[in-house]
């Protein structure tokens, strides 16, 4: 009685199981009662990445650098190219079908993250005592000088976008 | 030890201004921020301005830009708080309190006055 | 601004009973530099000025006693009275200091029950 399931890595064809073609290699011909299933290494530029009965390999993916890309990992027969994005860019999905620069923190903001090839940077607030006087995707917010350390004291408080101003001990008011 | 000492109760009329002065003691007063905080008749805290008396340097709640001058006088160590235009909404118990003391990591306050009991009623 | 949300507004407890006061920040008062949270507690009696309790988010300040203790991250905080004493009834407020205007929670009133 002919089969109505196969074992794994085997698909049923005409009433036969037939041996799938291996990760890396497409299917020619299907087996018969006397020959194996026949397969052929995938080309070029080509790849497979399952066990399979596929009669054509899938391209492997474009890293165009038209929209910011770049190859991370170079494909090969049994795995696709993985792209990222260009130093100061990020992929705007999983996929990473396209790249977007990278944000900014603006003044008053600090980099809490700094941005990767996958994830944008990630900015906070300056709290009291902190500021940054820059649009930065690096720098952190900086902490206040203290006056007191140099001898010098407090002549302009500080904002989360200024540092504080000082000056000597003896200044007029 | 650390002190802020208020000026007494207050009664006044709509429209007048009232000042009410804070002196501090046992602490450097130039280089310690002071904080004005109101409580009106059976509400919460409400943070209206401060001065680092060293510099002048002032911040103030938008609610109470204009409405509100603090200023400080190092020579006697005393902050003040003047409220102009004054409304009935304008009942409540001013507190002035220590804030940072330089180190910028004190900005939580640790010291507080007495509080004064502003009325106003015509 | 930052708002500040207390929860609950009051709650009625019995001497010896543990006590949790819950404050949400409408953003995070966690600064990653420090790792610290700018939230602070305070207690105040009816006709007193408000005292310090916890700095920091979970400080205890120097005199405090130890049933009192803060906890919690970012935009998440708890103020928790382990045994609540006859001294301990009061209204509680939290205050975030991360940025200006500072503001306060709307205070919780712990009464007897």
């Known amino acids: 009685e002919p089969p109505t399931a196969c074992r794994e890595k085997q698909y049923l064809i005409n009433s036969q199981c037939c041996s799938l073609c291996q990760p890396g290699q497409k299917l020619v011909s299907d087996c018969t009662e006397f020959t194996e299933t026949e397969c052929l290494p995938c080309g070029e530029s080509e790849f497979l990445d399952t066990w399979n009965r596929e009669t054509h390999c899938h391209q492997h993916k474009y890293c165009d650098p038209n929209l910011g890309l770049r190859v991370q990992q170079k494909g090969t027969s049994e795995t696709d190219t993985i792209c990222t994005c260009e130093e100061g860019w990020h992929c705007t999905s999983e996929a990473c079908e396209s790249c977007v620069l990278h944000r900014s923190c603006s003044p008053g903001f600090g980099v809490k993250q700094i941005a990767t090839g996958v994830s944008d940077t990630i900015c906070e607030p300056c709290p009291v005592g902190f500021f940054s006087n820059v649009s930065s995707a690096f720098e952190k917010c900086h902490p206040w000088t203290s006056c007191e350390t140099k001898d010098l004291v407090v002549q302009q408080a500080g904002t989360n976008k200024t540092d504080v101003v000082c000056g000597p001990q003896d200044r007029l008011r | 030890q650390v002190q802020l000492v208020q000026s007494g109760a207050e009664v006044k009329k709509p429209g007048s201004s009232v000042k009410v002065s804070c002196k501090a003691s046992g602490y450097t007063f130039s280089t310690s921020w002071i904080e004005w905080i109101r409580q009106a008749p059976g509400q919460g805290l409400e943070w209206m301005g401060s001065i680092l008396p060293g510099s002048g340097s002032t911040n103030y709640a938008e609610k109470f830009k204009g409405k509100v001058t603090i200023t400080a006088d190092e020579s006697t160590s005393t902050a003040y708080m003047e409220l102009s235009s004054l409304r009935s909404e304008d009942t409540a118990v001013y507190y002035c309190a220590r804030g940072d003391d330089g180190s910028y990591v004190r900005w939580y306050f640790d010291h507080w006055g007495q509080g004064t009991l502003v009325t106003v009623s015509s | 601004d930052i708002q500040m949300t207390q929860s609950p507004s009051s709650v009625s407890a019995s001497v010896g009973d543990r006590v949790t006061i819950t404050c949400r920040s409408s953003?995070?008062?966690?600064?990653?530099?420090?790792?610290?949270?700018?939230l602070a507690w305070y207690q105040q009696k009816p006709g007193k000025a408000p005292k310090l309790l916890i700095y920091w988010a979970s400080t205890r300040e120097s005199g405090v006693p130890d049933r009192f203790s803060g906890s919690g991250s970012g935009t998440d905080f708890t103020l928790t009275i382990s045994s609540l004493q006859p001294e301990d009834f009061a209204t509680y407020y939290c205050q975030h200091y991360y940025s200006y205007p500072w503001t306060f929670g709307q205070g919780t009133k712990v009464e007897i029950k």
């Open positions: 953003q995070s008062l966690l600064f990653s530099v420090n790792q610290k949270n700018y």
